[in-house]
């Protein structure tokens, strides 16, 4: 607790002080006072530099004195033998004695009192910037007229802050300009313009004279401009050292003028104005700016249009252009949007074809579709090459965005039929010789696959079973073989409207229009053992002549068995219709004259006993295409016959091509279109 006075005595005083003692006293008087310390008695062992015994007086880090020996007063009216005056309110006194004393020393007696200090004169650093007023225990500062005392209660300055300039144009000068500016002042000016305008400051060199920098280059008085996180300055010296035109890129500017106690000059004067905030003419690749201008400023709007093949992707939506506005902060709106190459995406897969995984799916990339050859070909042309177009679609030169269609190749067997192992009336065949051959198990019959969804057969095969089970791809009709082959499920049976339905089909004598179509539920996958036969063309090239050869195949009756286990086939010539009429019906169900012969029928056979028979019905009479020798077309369908091993009658398919096409078109699925 600070005291105004006090007494300090060495140990045992006035007796001799003991050896090996170290004692200290911390003196503290109230703040605003100094300390007057005086000794009235001093009797301490004398040594050089008071090394043995001593009394030490310390103020802060400074040793004010170190005493030893004997002292007596020089003034008979005063008991003081030694005194110290310090302008601080704290003092430390330390007494030390060593291990021995040659004589008996009595030590010291000292007293301290608090004394007033004159803060205005007693210190090197003047506490007040202008006027200093001392009083007992303290001081206060005061200012000349028109100055005010700052919050620190020491510095005076002029009241030059708080001005806010909002006009788009204006002039600001230092206080008293062009007379000397006040010392020890901090002047702050604020320019606050409407958003979207930047403050532009202009100065003339001659309008600036501020106390120059010190030898280290630090401005003693300074002018600083602060715009957001950007600072211009500090500036000082004779003549403005900075740019005469300062574009702040901000609508808010703080001007700070700081002066010290010395060296007042005339100061400075500046002009400012608000410029609409400029936005940079950015280089946005793959795009065009509309309108094109040398400079864009606040509130300007441009339309940025992507070049062909480029698009703006925002979220999941692609657009070809976007608008951008020069904003109040000097930045363009939508600046994140970029014109990127159009991405056509992973190309769609196609049925019975493939597309190689593209290296790139971006604008300009090229892909190629191919069909699963040799079983499928590209029906709608175009070569299968597509490029990624500017609209984001894969486009073909011929088809545009329409995908290629892989359709089955018709009439081409994987292996040609050769009559190698002769069997009476025909040969063993492999399904690869007749990949269009369809097996019907109830009734036991045949049919011809004409495309993925359709089987052509005789009307009499399906008239009694409108849900036939069919199989493709197997040479043998043994159960274990059929279990491994492809079973076809019918969706609908279409019998030719000209086919007469009878109460008792067994007694039929009229086989005119013996043709039917079976629509399948699912498309058939083509391959070496399953592939369609072509339909005849409508031109006269497809009119059969007597002697023209055709191939028949099936699992019908043979000389040995009612039903063949493995596919049999024969090559037969076309014969005149009369040849069929002349053959006596084997097991007639009516008079021979009752049997109907029409131009819708083809007569064939008669050679070496080769003929179709019961169980072959509905199978194709395949003839080489006159316009493409590599292909076969279904010239006829096994229909009926007077006697197995003679001549047989076949439905003339050419006469039904229009009905076939119309039926298929009217009953196609969207997938097939």
């Amino acid at each position: 607790e600070p005291t105004m006075y006090g007494e300090i005595l060495s140990p045992n005083y006035p007796q001799a002080y003991p050896s090996e003692v170290e004692k200290s006293w911390d003196i503290e008087v109230p703040e605003g006072y100094g300390i007057h310390l005086y000794f009235t008695h001093l009797d301490i062992e004398l040594s050089e530099n008071c090394a043995y015994d001593s009394v030490q007086i310390i103020s802060g880090d400074t040793e004010e004195g170190r005493l030893c020996g004997q002292r007596s007063s020089n003034n008979p009216h005063s008991p003081i033998v030694e005194e110290f005056q310090v302008p601080y309110n704290k003092l430390q006194v330390i007494f030390k004695s060593d291990f021995s004393n040659e004589e008996r020393f009595t030590g010291f007696a000292a007293y301290y009192v608090a004394t007033d200090i004159n803060e205005c004169t007693d210190f090197v650093d003047v506490p007040c910037s202008h006027f200093c007023n001392n009083f007992i225990g303290g001081y206060f500062c005061s200012c000349p007229p028109e100055y005010f005392l700052h919050d620190d209660m020491k510095n005076c300055g002029v009241n030059c802050s708080g001005d806010v300039f909002t006009a788009l144009i204006g002039e600001i000068a230092s206080p008293n300009y062009p007379k000397p500016y006040p010392e020890n002042s901090r002047c702050e000016y604020q320019i606050r313009l409407e958003k979207g305008f930047q403050v532009v400051v202009t100065l003339r060199r001659e309008d600036f004279d501020v106390e120059a920098a010190d030898s280290a280059g630090n401005c003693l008085d300074s002018l600083v401009f602060v715009a957001g996180d950007r600072q211009f300055g500090p500036y000082c010296g004779h003549g403005f050292p900075g740019p005469l035109n300062i574009e702040t890129k901000s609508n808010a500017l703080d001007i700070i003028f700081q002066t010290d106690l010395t060296g007042q000059k005339k100061g400075w004067k500046l002009r400012y104005h608000g410029d609409p905030m400029p936005c940079p003419k950015e280089d946005t690749p793959n795009s065009v700016w509309e309108p094109a201008k040398a400079k864009y400023v606040f509130r300007d709007v441009v339309q940025i249009t992507c070049l062909d093949g480029f698009e703006v992707v925002e979220g999941r939506v692609g657009a070809t252009s976007f608008y951008s506005t020069c904003q109040s902060n000097g930045k363009w709106s939508n600046s994140k949007l970029k014109c990127q190459p159009v991405d056509c995406g992973i190309p769609e897969s196609i049925e019975n074809g493939k597309v190689e995984d593209p290296e790139s799916t971006l604008f300009g990339s090229v892909i190629r579709y191919t069909c699963e050859e040799p079983y499928y070909y590209m029906e709608n042309g175009g070569g299968g090459e597509y490029h990624c177009a500017g609209n984001g679609s894969w486009v073909n030169e011929v088809l545009g965005p329409e995908l290629p269609k892989c359709v089955p190749v018709c009439g081409v067997p994987r292996e040609p039929f050769e009559e190698k192992q002769r069997i009476i009336g025909g040969s063993d065949a492999d399904i690869k010789n007749f990949p269009w051959q369809v097996f019907f198990d109830n009734p036991w019959a045949g049919g011809a696959l004409i495309n993925e969804y359709w089987v052509l057969t005789a009307a009499h095969v399906v008239e009694g079973n409108r849900e036939p089970t069919m199989y493709v791809g197997s040479t043998s009709v043994q159960t274990s073989r059929l279990a491994k082959s492809k079973m076809l499920t019918p969706e609908h049976v279409f019998i030719h409207p000209g086919w007469k339905l009878l109460e008792v089909p067994e007694g039929r004598t009229n086989f005119d229009n013996d043709i039917a179509l079976v629509r399948l539920k699912d498309p058939v996958k083509m391959g070496p053992t399953v592939s369609p036969i072509c339909l005849p063309g409508t031109s006269s090239d497809y009119n059969l002549m007597d002697g023209d050869l055709g191939l028949i195949s099936g699992w019908g009756r043979t000389e040995k068995r009612d039903r063949a286990v493995r596919l049999k086939a024969a090559r037969l010539p076309v014969a005149p219709l009369r040849k069929c009429k002349e053959v006596k019906v084997e097991k007639p169900t009516a008079d021979a004259e009752a049997y109907v012969f029409t131009p819708n029928m083809i007569c064939a056979g008669g050679e070496k006993g080769m003929d179709s028979c019961k169980g072959d019905s509905g199978g194709a009479f395949a003839v080489q295409d006159p316009n493409d020798k590599t292909k076969f077309y279904a010239a006829g369908l096994v229909s009926w016959g007077p006697q197995c091993g003679t001549y047989g009658l076949y439905t003339r398919v050419k006469n039904y091509v229009d009905w076939i096409m119309k039926t298929m078109q009217e009953n196609s699925t969207p997938r097939e279109d």
């Epitope: 097996f439 198990d441 109830n442 036991w444 089970t469 040479t475 043998s476 009709v477 043994q478 159960t479 274990s480 073989r481 059929l482 279990a483 079973m487 040995k560 068995r561 039903r563 286990v565 493995r566």
Partner: antibody, heavy 119, light 107 residues
């Protein structure tokens, strides 16, 4: 109609082999697929295997793999089934059966051959 | 190999009853399933093939249904001649395995 005539009953000792024959008449063996089925007394039917003429390979039930051999002599239209390393549980009636067509599994059955394995 | 599980193993019924026998395949066999009837000392007789097709000469009281893995044989009205053992057989895979059989006996 195909007829299948099998060889007569056999009595064999454990560890021995038995060869059962099956003669086809009314058709040729080349046109047929022959299967073999057995039935132990009071037990169920067990399919043993078949010769697949299309693939030219014999397919055996897992249970008999390594012990059974099925062969055919097309010149005499006779099929054979040989079972080796016989054990008492092989005592059964062994049938040869022709495979049917168009979804019918078995067409014609032989009269059966009783093989008795006893020490 | 595909396993065939037939149930029940024994079934007691009276003449005129409707009888159902179930056969379950361990994996799909499409419709490649047959049903046989066997009487003691005789070779099995085919009743149903391709799951639901009735073999010629078999009375219409026998019917089959199902596809994939679940199949049933139904005798709509049991006759005295129908007391026998019935077997299912799959013939989809190379191994044409039989079920273990269901004996239909007089109640």
């Amino acid at each position: 109609q195909v007829q299948l005539v099998q060889s007569g009953a056999e009595v064999k000792k454990p560890g021995a082999s038995v060869k059962v024959s099956c003669k086809v008449s009314g058709d040729t063996l080349t046109e047929l697929s022959m299967h073999w089925v057995r039935q132990a007394p009071g037990k169920g039917l067990e399919w043993m295997g078949t010769f697949d003429p299309e693939e030219g390979e014999t397919i055996y039930a897992q249970k008999f793999q390594g012990r059974v051999t099925m062969t055919e002599d097309t010149s005499t239209d006779t099929a054979y089934m040989e079972l080796s390393y016989l054990r008492s549980e092989d005592t059964a009636v062994y049938y040869c059966v022709t495979e049917g067509l168009a979804g019918i599994p078995f067409d014609s059955w032989g009269q059966g051959t009783l093989v008795t394995v006893s020490s | 190999d595909i396993q065939m599980t037939q149930s029940p193993s024994t079934l007691s019924a009276s003449v005129g009853d409707r009888v159902t026998i179930t056969c379950r395949a361990s994996q799909s066999i499409s419709s490649w399933l047959a049903w046989y009837q066997q009487k003691p000392g005789k070779a099995p007789k085919l009743l149903i093939y391709k799951a639901s097709s009735l073999e010629s000469g078999v009375p219409s009281r026998f019917s089959g249904s199902g596809s994939g893995t679940e199949f049933t044989l139904t005798i709509s009205s049991l006759q005295p001649d129908d007391f026998a053992t019935y077997y299912c057989q799959q013939y989809n895979s190379p191994s044409w395995l039989f079920g273990q059989g269901t004996k239909v006996e007089i109640k």
